[in-house]
């Protein structure tokens, strides 16, 4: 079980996850398990493409909003953090890593600069930033 | 019917700070950004900068950075601004406007409080 | 940041005339355009926000166009309650910017 501490670290308040349950999983080891996906915070910077990388190499993506429901932890996430969400410019619209196209109602998207790639915020806000920039990130897998 | 009420006017002296309230009702305080806009006399409008309610996140303008803090009191509805380091520049009217969201982009502000009037001056 | 050029600064129309005013982004804003009437000692009120979409209880003489980085505002038969200071204004990136307004006059 994560300790107190990690979960502090990566949340705006204590955070009550059910880590051992046995309907969640199979996660790798030591990531959070969370109404059937498997979520991994990485504290070390890396631009987006690298982050990308990095979790596809762990066999997972990077983190795709689809539920504000099933993801209600994310409501807590502190700090800004590398999401799967790309902009494409030929359309305007925003898409996963997948390629399903950005449901409408999930995110608030904010644009600081110009740029095409998000990262997460507390309370599902994407911040758009340069996707050369390095930034923490968190990767996701589902377990169903 | 959404309404946003502003505290009062106030008058402040050079390096001073002021807190300018704006209380909302009539919808779901946590589900609309709130912006802050200031007018300055026989001016334009402009923006200072805009808070989630549901949570404590801002974005302010460069202009103002450092000077400027805004808070809500999810208890009472109320979104505040505080303004430090007061000069004669700030001598503004001083608008809180709730945000339109429209799925995917808070771009707009639909409805405005009555405004206060802050005045700096020694 | 983006700027909104707004012209012209200041307008002069009749009664019942047709009057337009146009709003210029620095950068595409694809649609993220809205427009605001102020009256003296008042606070700003929504008219149009995206582009062209009416607030509710507006009248539907006033109207707005454009896409990208060039926006037109219009008042299709001016009316004596229409004298104040409108303003466009882009919501797609930080920081949120006004054009300097047009003000309206009747003759």
């Known amino acids: 079980i994560w300790s107190a501490v990690f979960l502090n670290s990566l949340f705006n308040q204590e955070v009550q996850i059910p880590l051992t349950e046995s309907y969640c999983g199979p996660c790798p080891k030591n990531w959070i398990c969370y109404k059937n996906n498997c979520y991994q915070f990485f504290d070390e910077s890396k631009n987006w493409y690298e982050s990308q990388a990095s979790c596809m190499s762990q066999n997972a993506s990077l983190l795709k909003v689809y539920s504000k429901e099933d993801q209600d932890l994310l409501k807590l996430v502190k700090s800004y953090h590398w999401m799967g969400l790309v902009h494409i410019p030929t359309n305007g619209s925003w898409q996963w890593e997948d390629g399903s196209i950005l449901s409408p109602n999930l995110l608030t998207i904010i644009e600081m600069q110009k740029g095409d790639c998000a990262l997460y915020a507390s309370s599902f806000k994407g911040y758009i930033e340069n996707c050369s920039t390095p930034n923490t990130y968190i990767c996701m897998q589902r377990t169903v | 019917q959404v309404q946003l009420v502003q505290s009062g006017a106030e008058v402040k002296k050079p390096g001073a700070s002021v807190k300018v309230s704006c209380k909302a009702s009539?919808?779901?305080?946590?589900?609309?950004?709130m912006h802050w806009v200031r007018q300055a006399p026989g001016q334009g409008l402009e923006w200072m900068g805009e808070i989630d309610p549901s949570d404590i996140y801002t974005n302010y303008a460069q202009k103002f950075q450092g000077r400027v803090t805004m808070t809500r009191d999810t208890s009472t509805s109320t979104v505040y601004m505080e303004l430090s380091s007061l000069r004669s520049e700030d001598t503004a009217v001083y608008y809180c406007?709730?945000?339109?969201?429209?799925?995917?982009?808070?771009?707009?502000?639909?409805?405005w409080g009555q405004g206060t009037t802050v005045t700096v001056s020694s | 940041y983006i700027q909104m050029t707004q012209s012209p600064s200041s307008l002069s129309a009749s009664v019942g005339d047709r009057v337009t005013i146009t709003c210029r982004s620095s950068q595409d804003i694809s649609n993220y355009l809205n427009w605001y009437q102020q009256k003296p000692g008042k606070a700003p009120k929504l008219l149009i926000y995206y582009t062209s979409r009416l607030h509710s209880g507006v009248p539907s003489r006033f109207s707005g166009s454009g896409s990208g980085t060039d926006f037109t505002f219009t008042i299709s038969s001016l009316q004596p309650e229409d004298i104040a200071t409108y303003y466009c204004?882009?919501?797609?990136?930080?920081?949120?910017?006004f054009g300097g307004g047009t003000k309206v006059e009747i003759k």
């Open positions: 406007a709730r945000g339109i969201y429209d799925g995917y982009y808070v771009y707009g502000m639909d409805y």
């Open positions: 204004q882009q919501g797609k990136t930080l920081p949120r910017t």
């Open positions: 009539g919808y779901t305080f946590t589900n609309y950004w």
